[in-house]
Interface confidence: low
């Protein structure tokens, strides 16, 4: 059972003699008189299992110590850190020929984890280890231990595991700790990409290319890659990931936007506060919901404030000129927070008797500059009927008006066009013809263009050809023309008059008076 000791994050320990509870039980050859397992106390009064040998008086020493089998866990290169004390031969009297100040370090790769014996010829020498000047002094009760640390590496390894061996050739040594580890580039997150634990390459100069995977709630911008160096350090980050919409980078993670914040796109931006007149009630919002009564147009960016339809235009003024109307108005008090305001004109023709009975004006009416999408606050409307009630509505609209179910952004005005001269009378009839009189009747003009004040009948003898004519005026749509000559052809014209003047005369009606006293009844346009 091994206790936990803290080592750098880029080192993975395969063996640590200091962490083993109880005896190490490594194999020594010879079994007696060579390496011996000895417990000492370290500076914290914790027992340490050490291996010691000190056969400095005797020549030709060849004492071997072999570890248990060590799994390589996929590592191709491993490091051996040895902490040891080694006595200076000068401090030992009478050992000049036999005392050594080095020992040898060996390894042997094997798939067999239960080899019981040391076969020296199987082992490959890693190095000769000597004590250098760099030692640490460790207080072990009444003594000070001069502790040397040496690190060697070996590789490439290919079998499942290996054994280490220490050969003493006549030194006075205590192996205080043996640690075997390999180096990895530890799991890391760089540019929002996670790079897994990666074992370093086989040789000391190799770089292992590693592809990263985007952290949760992120996506690749450029393929994230890094290189794992032989010393367990990550090098040369390439590419990156970006937090998804609704998420931002916090502490190397893509975390959901907080309530009241949003992020619309996968970018490296942080979440933004909801724009004015909008809100988000859940974490991870990609857009903010508009407050009630506020809207976002289809082409509005998520970063734009929510806006409203405009209020009604103000100060609508009308100016009637015969059958034309000029309208002018002021911009609404509230544009709804938008710049794209325009105006639409609605024209309704309303009955004089019942203004509620209005109908669209139809295509005969013309608008200058246009009827819909006006950018100016004035419009001229022409080709209206004279003496007619019209209601004009001016609607203020903007990019979100179509989303408003209850529009109230219009202002209206009702006007009556001026009277004009009436149109001509289409049909004049001779209802009765006698020797001395003609009874005429006619229809009202198609377009009275006002109140008909009177009708004027002009008549003359046909052969006089209008050189000498007479006029009769009447408010009715019929009249008796008396005092005519018998058996004479007369030509009759009728026209109507309003306050604006006379209309055109009707087409001529030719009638010939009778010679006999009896009456002739006629209804044609040309009675004879």
């Amino acid at each position: 059972v091994t206790g936990s000791r803290v080592y750098p994050a880029n080192e993975v320990t395969l063996l640590d003699s200091r962490s083993v509870q109880g005896e190490l039980g490594w194999i020594a050859s010879p079994l007696e008189g060579g390496w011996e397992e000895v417990s000492i106390m370290d500076e914290k009064n914790t027992p340490i299992r050490t291996y010691q040998v000190c056969n400095v008086m005797e020549p030709s020493q060849n004492n071997w110590l072999r570890t248990d089998w060590i799994t390589r866990e996929g590592a191709q290169r491993v490091y051996i850190e040895i902490k040891f004390t080694l006595r200076d031969c000068n401090s030992l009297p009478g050992v000049m020929g036999t005392c050594k100040e080095t020992f040898n370090l060996y390894y042997y790769e094997s798939d067999n984890d239960k080899e019981r014996f040391i076969r020296e010829n199987q082992f490959v020498k890693i190095d000769t280890i000597a004590a250098d000047e760099s030692f640490t002094q460790v207080d072990i009760g009444d003594r000070i231990m001069k502790l040397n640390t040496e690190i060697r590496d070996v590789g490439p390894l290919s079998k499942k595991g290996f054994y280490l061996a220490f050969q003493d050739v006549g030194a006075c040594i205590a192996l205080v700790s043996v640690r075997v580890f390999y180096k990895k580039c530890p799991l890391t997150v760089r540019n929002l990409a996670q790079f897994p634990d990666t074992i370093t390459g086989a040789d000391t100069s190799s770089l292992v290319e590693v592809r990263g995977s985007c952290v949760n709630n992120s996506e690749e911008k450029d393929v994230p890659k890094m290189y794992c160096g032989a010393d367990g350090e990550w090098l040369v980050p390439i590419g990156n990931c970006l937090c998804n919409a609704g998420h931002e980078e916090r502490s190397g993670e893509c975390q959901a936007c907080k309530i009241g914040y949003y992020k619309a796109l996968s970018t490296d931006a942080t979440c933004a506060k909801c724009p004015p007149h909008s809100y988000s009630v859940w974490e991870g919002a990609t857009s903010c919901t508009c407050d009630r009564g506020f809207f976002r147009a289809d082409n509005d960016a998520a970063s734009m404030p929510c806006t409203r339809p405009p209020s009604a235009p103000l100060n609508l003024i009308s100016n009637v000129n015969e059958t034309s109307v000029n309208l002018e108005w002021s911009s609404p008090q509230n544009t709804g927070g938008r710049q794209d305001i325009s105006y639409n004109v609605v024209c309704k023709k309303c009955g004089a008797g019942d203004p509620s009975k209005c109908r669209p004006c139809g295509s005969g009416v013309h608008y200058t500059p246009q009827q819909n999408g006006l950018k100016t606050t004035k419009v001229s409307i022409t080709d209206l009927l004279a003496h007619t009630n019209y209601t004009f509505e001016i609607w203020a609209v903007n990019g979100v008006s179509k989303y408003n179910p209850n529009p109230d952004q219009s202002v209206s005005v009702t006007v009556t066009t001026n009277q004009a001269a009436p149109s001509s009378i289409a049909l004049v009839q001779a209802k009765e013809v006698t020797r001395y009189s003609v009874a005429l009747a006619w229809l009202e003009p198609d377009r009275p263009n006002g109140v008909i004040l009177e009708y004027e009948v002009k008549y003359y003898e046909k052969d006089q050809n209008e050189r000498s004519y007479r006029i009769v005026r009447t408010a009715a749509r019929n009249t008796d023309i008396k005092g005519l000559n018998p058996l004479t052809s007369y030509v009759f014209h009728v026209r109507a008059r309003t306050a604006a003047g006379y209309g055109d005369f009707s087409e001529p009606l030719e009638v010939t008076t009778n010679t006999v006293p009896s009456r002739i009844i006629g209804d044609g346009a040309n009675s004879t």
Epitope: K258, Y279, V281, E283
Partner: antibody, heavy 124, light 107 residues
């Protein structure tokens, strides 16, 4: 003034159903979501979930999925909690409480108005 | 789910005492916390929201503080009508759990 008035106490047998009402007045019903909170005898408060008064969509806390149903009748500004297959452990006071459905600036939530509570006793 | 741990579960105090109740969330709730007062047989009443904001009509002797995971409700000078049970509640990701309550009794 703003009020949530709940229906009266109920005594039910195990296996029966009960429907608790919560009538809102003094504000626009659909402007606030309605939440339900349970308090077992001598115990603390436990949030059961809520109903969106505009869409009618309910959300249930994990412990209240299955036998508990939230519903509405917006025409009378009333929210309902129905519990079916009643068990003795459903004995509790049930409260309704409101939270604004729309937020105009503040991102902090709280139950500002509570019903007076309806005691449901389940006993054979 | 976020757990809300209130302490103490009960306390005895006298009129005029300064009383402090703490509420600890199992993770950062970013000040999304409300405090309620409940008297026997009555519905809870809102005291504070957003950890520190006093609700309408609540006396100024009640105050709140805290951020992250640790929050405090303080009654600066306990009045007879303040003897009740107090609950904290978080609003940071559903379910919105309450603390188990702190009963303030007369000493």
């Amino acid at each position: 003034q703003v009020q949530l008035v709940q229906s009266g106490s109920e005594l039910k047998k195990p296996g029966a159903s009960v429907k608790v009402s919560c009538k809102a007045s003094g504000y626009t019903f659909t402007d606030y979501s309605m939440h339900w909170v349970r308090q077992a005898p001598g115990q603390g408060l436990k949030w059961m979930g809520w109903i969106n008064t505009e869409t009618g969509e309910p959300t249930y806390a994990d412990d209240f999925k299955g036998r508990f149903v939230f519903s509405l009748d917006t025409s009378v500004s009333t929210a309902y909690l129905q519990i079916s297959s009643l068990k003795a452990e459903d004995t509790a006071v049930y409260y309704c409480a409101r939270i604004p459905l729309y937020y105009y600036g503040s991102r902090y939530w709280y139950f500002d108005v509570w019903g007076q509570g309806t005691t449901v006793t389940v006993s054979s | 789910d976020i757990q809300m741990t209130q302490s103490p579960s009960s306390l005895s105090a006298s009129v005029g005492d300064r009383v402090t109740i703490t509420c600890r969330a199992s993770e950062n709730i970013y000040r999304n916390l409300a405090w309620y007062q409940q008297k026997p047989g009555k519905a809870p009443q809102l005291l504070l929201y957003a950890a520190t904001n006093l609700a309408d009509g609540v006396p100024s002797r009640f105050s709140g503080s805290g951020s992250g995971t640790d929050y405090t409700l303080t009654i600066s000078s306990l009045q007879p009508e303040d003897f009740a049970t107090y609950y904290c509640q978080h609003f940071w990701g559903t379910p919105w759990t309450f603390g188990q309550g702190t009963k303030v009794e007369i000493k």
